[in-house]
């Protein structure tokens, strides 16, 4: 509305896997005759306005964010102000603002969504021997080091959802990754298969685990 420099970023969040590099795209339209000496570029955390990376006084001032950020110097003159964030961590998740100042100034915010896939669930049974129809057992489904928090679903061998008597807990480790433990209490039939599905809502990734109880003995599917 003011004729100020127009800064463009993706509307959708940028999804990055933990440990990988992410590019936060940002662009502006340089006017004819534009030179990098005119450019002042600031990347910052949106909420706090804490400096992440800057390009001022005609040069890259470097990373102010754990030395894990970089610009694309060869592309700046064409209006590419994107930021490379290396070795993404859970703590990086959030909104980043790209602030561009040339003759005037403008800004735009881009969201970083961090994700990590969950491991294939391991299944344990308690008690795990001398089982008879009518016994109550607890089946525990454990999946590790995922992000964000998982959705857990249980079903029987016929694909019927099991929603009662399920307790799910999720604990974050020091890196912010979640370990999920879901416990199903069930009364055994003559035989049966019990499956747990751990879903990462961001990656739309499903990790499956199942246990089959056939009187004596019980069998566990081999690990994939």
């Amino acid at each position: 509305p003011t004729g100020a420099v127009e800064v463009q970023v993706p509307e959708d969040p940028v999804v990055a896997l933990v440990g990988t590099d992410a590019t936060l795209r940002c662009s502006f339209s340089p006017e004819p005759g534009f030179s990098l000496a005119q450019l002042n570029l600031i990347w910052q955390l949106t909420d706090t306005k804490q400096l992440v990376h800057s390009f001022t006084e005609g040069r890259d001032q470097g990373s102010a964010y754990a030395n894990r950020t970089a610009l694309f110097p060869d592309l700046l003159a064409q209006g590419n102000a994107s930021l490379r964030l290396q070795r993404v961590r859970v703590a990086d998740e959030g909104s980043f603002t790209c602030f561009v100042s040339i003759r005037d100034f403008g800004s735009a915010a881009v969201s970083l969504q961090v994700a990590a896939p969950y491991s294939k669930p391991s299944m344990t049974l308690e008690p795990n021997k001398d089982l008879r129809p009518g016994d109550t057992v607890t089946i525990t489904c454990s999946s590790y080091r995922g992000y964000p928090e998982a959705e857990v679903f249980w079903q029987d061998g016929q694909g019927v959802p099991l929603t009662g008597n399920v307790t799910t807990s999720q604990m974050a480790n020091e890196q912010g990754l979640f370990d999920v433990h879901s416990v199903l209490r069930v009364v055994l039939g003559a035989n049966g298969t019990y499956s747990c599905l751990v879903r990462n809502p961001v990656l739309q990734q499903d990790a499956h685990g199942s246990v089959t109880i056939t009187g004596q003995p019980m069998t566990f599917p081999p690990e994939a």
Partner: antibody
């Protein structure tokens, strides 16, 4: 403690221009936006524009485009707002207000420091 | 033009709690709008109370808090004091400019 001290009251004729100054003192380092905000009698606050003194770049509200010029002199820590083609409805109190572009403390306090205001009266 | 809507006036009692809101014509207010709340009393310059949605400026009493509620910026005063009678303006940042709301006149009875 940062303070913003503005120039004194002005009485101007319609069609003329006025230039108001805003001097920052006390811990003026960092990257700041100096905003100019006015308040006409009995009215609310109205953002006119702002400048980043360190970069010398300014933006203006559409309503004032072409009639307002905001400048800054980094060496004296002073920002200026010049409004031309004055009309009677430009009679107002004009304020400068500091806003952080980058929060060096890691906390964004927003427009936390305001000048005392400069009364501009436009009358024939 | 971006329009911002505040309650024209609100009345509360000393010791009570009151919430002032600020709605934007562009849709939900987000953290990237850096909602500011400014207090103005007769004959005094405006005073910045809250910046960055919920950060109290130095000197702002703890009874003032900022937040986002239902897509609007909000200022809550908990344990209202007689000296809180004033006009409160919100301001939102839109990429390259600030826009002020029309103000809420808070009366303490």
């Amino acid at each position: 403690q940062v303070q913003l001290v503005q120039s004194g009251a002005e009485v101007k004729k319609p069609g003329s221009s006025v230039k108001v100054s805003c001097k920052a003192s006390g811990g003026t380092g960092g990257i700041y936006l100096i905003n100019w905000v006015r308040q006409a009698p009995g009215q609310g606050l109205e953002w006119m524009g702002g400048i980043i003194p360190l970069f010398g770049t300014a933006n203006y509200a559409q309503k004032f485009q072409g009639r307002v010029t905001i400048t800054a002199d980094e060496s004296t820590s002073t920002a200026y707002m010049e409004l031309s083609s004055l009309r009677s409805d430009d009679t107002a109190v004009y304020y400068c207000a500091r806003d952080q572009v980058v929060a060096t403390s890691g906390v964004n306090f927003g427009m936390d420091v305001w000048g005392q205001g400069t009364t501009v009266t436009v009358s024939s | 033009d971006i329009q911002m809507t505040q309650e024209p006036s609100l009345t509360t009692s000393p010791g009570g709690t009151v919430t002032l809101t600020c709605r934007s014509s562009t849709g939900a207010v987000t953290t990237s709008n850096y909602a500011n709340w400014v207090q103005e009393k007769p004959g005094q310059a405006p005073r910045g109370l809250i910046g960055g949605t919920n950060k109290r400026a130095p000197g702002t009493p703890a009874r003032f808090s900022g937040s986002l509620i239902g897509g609007k910026a909000a200022l809550t005063i908990t344990g209202v004091q007689p000296e809180d009678e004033a006009i409160y303006f919100c301001a939102l940042w839109y990429s390259n400019l600030w826009v002020f709301g029309g103000g809420t006149k808070l009366e303490i009875k």
